[in-house]
Interface confidence: low
């Protein structure tokens, strides 16, 4: 018996061939011997089966001795043995229809779980293997689960169902809702304007929700909400903003925040959360602000940084075009009785300069100039 696998919602064509290459009498029946369709001369006739409005044949092939049964918009319950009667012969074809669906919305938040459920006909024992867009394989029986979805899981999942040594392939498009970056860090000199950007890693027609930026300043004992906002069809509107600092927010995506001035008291870490309509859970992006200040007080030239720096970052003070006078893995360095000239304060990581601040030291009778 020939086995044919079909996909729920698809169209399948079951073949039936006569030895004579001409149009002759044929009938297709199901396992209950109920007639589905056949011919009367050159006319297509249909029986009382449940497939009535979904069954068809190709009249153009009858003259060649081919009498296919076409079933449209396949359903799991169409799984059956179909019998083609032609030339006093019976050809049997077993049709097995499978469906594969995501248990929830195909738009899922980063970190959530994806469950794929296989619908299969009774008595079948299929195996399923799915391959994620990043090449990860998962295998199982009636259900397959992937926990902790990552951004790279966005895209087309290719799932293959194996039954009776036959294969049928499903493609499911999954969108993982996340920010492009889990975390970012901004380095600024004191007084500079700070731009925070929170680009999303997905595009959808309509995007509605609400968000908030909580900030934990390094100098503060607790975190506080800096801004709350609404998102309606990709339009951003601010609901509430603190007076200090007075953040400004862009009206369009990507989410964009401006801090008028980088000040030591603002240095720290923030967490932007975005709750999307009809989704449980929230999207998160961490943002960090490091602020540098170079000052000269009396005979002491000092350079300081505030904010979340890693232990491997190096802070240096050097006179222009000379070797560093002081270099430490600390958040403050100083030079006593600095020579006159343009001094540079450098924050670097493995030789790469992240932040630079210049301060001009004048001869002792003058006051310092900060460009």
């Amino acid at each position: 018996k020939k086995v044919v696998l079909g996909k729920k919602g698809d169209t399948v064509e079951l073949t039936c061939t006569a030895s004579q290459k001409k149009s002759i009498q044929f009938h297709w029946k199901n396992s209950n011997q109920i007639k589905i369709l056949g011919n009367q001369g050159s006319f297509l006739t249909k029986g009382p089966s449940k497939l009535n409005d979904r069954a068809d044949s190709r009249r153009s092939l009858w003259d060649q001795g081919n009498f296919p049964l076409i079933i449209k918009n396949l359903k799991i319950e169409d799984s059956d043995t179909y019998i083609c009667e032609v030339e006093d012969q019976k050809e049997e074809v077993q049709l097995l229809v499978f469906g594969l669906t995501a248990n929830s919305d195909t738009h899922l938040l980063q970190g959530q779980s994806l469950t794929l459920t296989l619908e299969s006909p009774p008595g079948s024992s299929p195996s399923v293997q799915c391959r994620s867009p990043r090449g990860k394989n998962i295998q199982g029986g009636k259900t397959l689960s992937v926990s902790q979805l990552e951004l790279q899981d966005s895209g087309t999942w290719t799932c293959t169902v194996l039954q009776n040594q036959k294969k049928v392939e499903f493609k499911i498009d999954i969108v993982v809702l996340a920010f492009q970056k889990a975390s970012s860090i901004v380095y600024k000199k004191e007084g500079e304007q700070v731009e925070f950007s929170f680009p999303l890693a997905f595009t959808v027609e309509k995007l509605t929700g609400s968000g908030e930026l909580w900030w934990q300043a390094e100098r503060a004992s607790s975190s506080k909400s800096w801004i709350t906002f609404d998102l309606k069809n990709k339009e951003v509107s601010v609901k509430r903003v603190t007076q200090d600092p007075k953040l400004q927010m862009g009206k369009k995506l990507p989410l964009h925040l401006t801090l008028p001035q980088a000040l030591p008291q603002y240095a720290g870490s923030g967490n932007l959360t975005l709750a999307l309509e009809a989704k449980t859970g929230k999207l998160h992006q961490e943002v960090n602000l490091v602020v540098m200040r170079a000052t000269q007080l009396q005979k002491n030239l000092t350079c300081e940084v505030w904010g979340p720096t890693s232990p491997k970052l190096m802070l240096s003070l050097k006179l222009e075009n000379k070797e560093a006078k002081v270099s430490k893995r600390e958040k403050a360095v100083w030079v006593l009785n600095p020579e006159a000239g343009m001094w540079q304060c450098l924050l670097s990581d493995s030789g790469q300069v992240l932040l630079e601040s210049n301060i001009k030291v004048l001869p002792t009778w003058s006051t310092p100039v900060q460009p």
């Epitope: 024992s125 195996s127 293997q129 391959r131 394989n137 998962i138 295998q139 199982g140 029986g141 290719t158 799932c159 293959t160 194996l162 040594q165 294969k167 392939e169």
Partner: antibody, heavy 119, light 107 residues
Framework: QVQLQESGPGLVKPSETLSLTCTVS????????WSWIRQPPGKGLEWIGY???????NYNPSLKSRVTISVDTSKNQLSLKLRSVTAADTAVYYC?????????????WGQGTTVTVSS | DIQMTQSPSSLSASVGDRVTITCQAS??????LNWYQQKPGKAPKLLIY???NLETGVPSRFSGSGSGTDFTFAISSLQPEDIATYYC?????????FGGGTKVEIK
């Protein structure tokens, strides 16, 4: 780190049944196919068959009448039985984790066990 | 059964040479092809899956290409540790079948 270890008698008499066990450690037997492959001395690789953890099996038609592969998920083991052996069944027998039918390949193998069929 | 024909059956090349092995399937197998390396006395090791995808941890000097019936496996710069027999394997259809193998030696 998943590891596979084949075990069983190294010598089997002609017409008897060859029985081998493959123990899976460092991971679950679930959600994979588990294949048996053999390699006669100085020759190439021949696939014997596989079992899915759910119990679904597929065998090489050339051996189908003589082979049975089974799985014990509680012990994380699979076994191979090959009946009515002859000298032609002398080979190194490997078990391997098979990613399946749509992609992947056999990515984890046991070190193999040598079986000699001789009276 | 699908027959897999590998050629050459053996080859000898110098360290640093580019080495190529071909594998031909008796029917269209799309990209359902794997390549394995087997060193003497050891189990085979998966190098390439889906005809061209490098298995995790496998050096980038190994590569695979092809689709349908004709496939190629290459080592861009042969190293002493690459002395082994290489096998192709199809999994488009059961039974799974292997090529006869190509023994690679150093000149």
């Amino acid at each position: 780190q998943v590891q596979l270890q084949e075990s069983g008698p190294g010598l089997v008499k002609p017409s008897e049944t060859l029985s081998l066990t493959c123990t899976v450690s460092g991971g679950s037997i679930s959600h994979y196919y588990w294949s048996w492959i053999r390699q006669p001395p100085g020759k190439g690789l021949e696939w014997i068959g596989y079992i899915h953890y759910s119990g679904t099996t597929n065998y090489n038609p050339s051996l189908k009448s003589r082979v049975t592969i089974s799985v014990d998920t509680s012990k994380n083991q699979l076994s191979l039985k090959l009946r009515s052996v002859t000298a032609a069944d002398t080979a190194v027998y490997y078990c391997a984790r098979d990613q399946g039918f749509s992609s992947g390949g056999m990515d984890v193998w046991g070190q193999g066990t040598t079986v000699t069929v001789s009276s | 059964d699908i027959q897999m024909t590998q050629s050459p059956s053996s080859l000898s090349a110098s360290v640093g040479d580019r080495v190529t092995i071909t594998c031909q399937a008796s029917q269209d197998i799309s990209n359902y092809l794997n390549w394995y390396q087997q060193k003497p006395g050891k189990a085979p090791k998966l190098l390439i899956y889906d005809a061209s995808n490098l298995e995790t941890g496998v050096p980038s000097r190994f590569s695979g290409s092809g689709s349908g019936t004709d496939f190629t496996f290459a080592i861009s710069s042969l190293q002493p540790e690459d002395i082994a027999t290489y096998y192709c394997q199809q999994y488009d259809n059961l039974p799974l079948t292997f090529g006869g193998g190509t023994k690679v030696e150093i000149k």
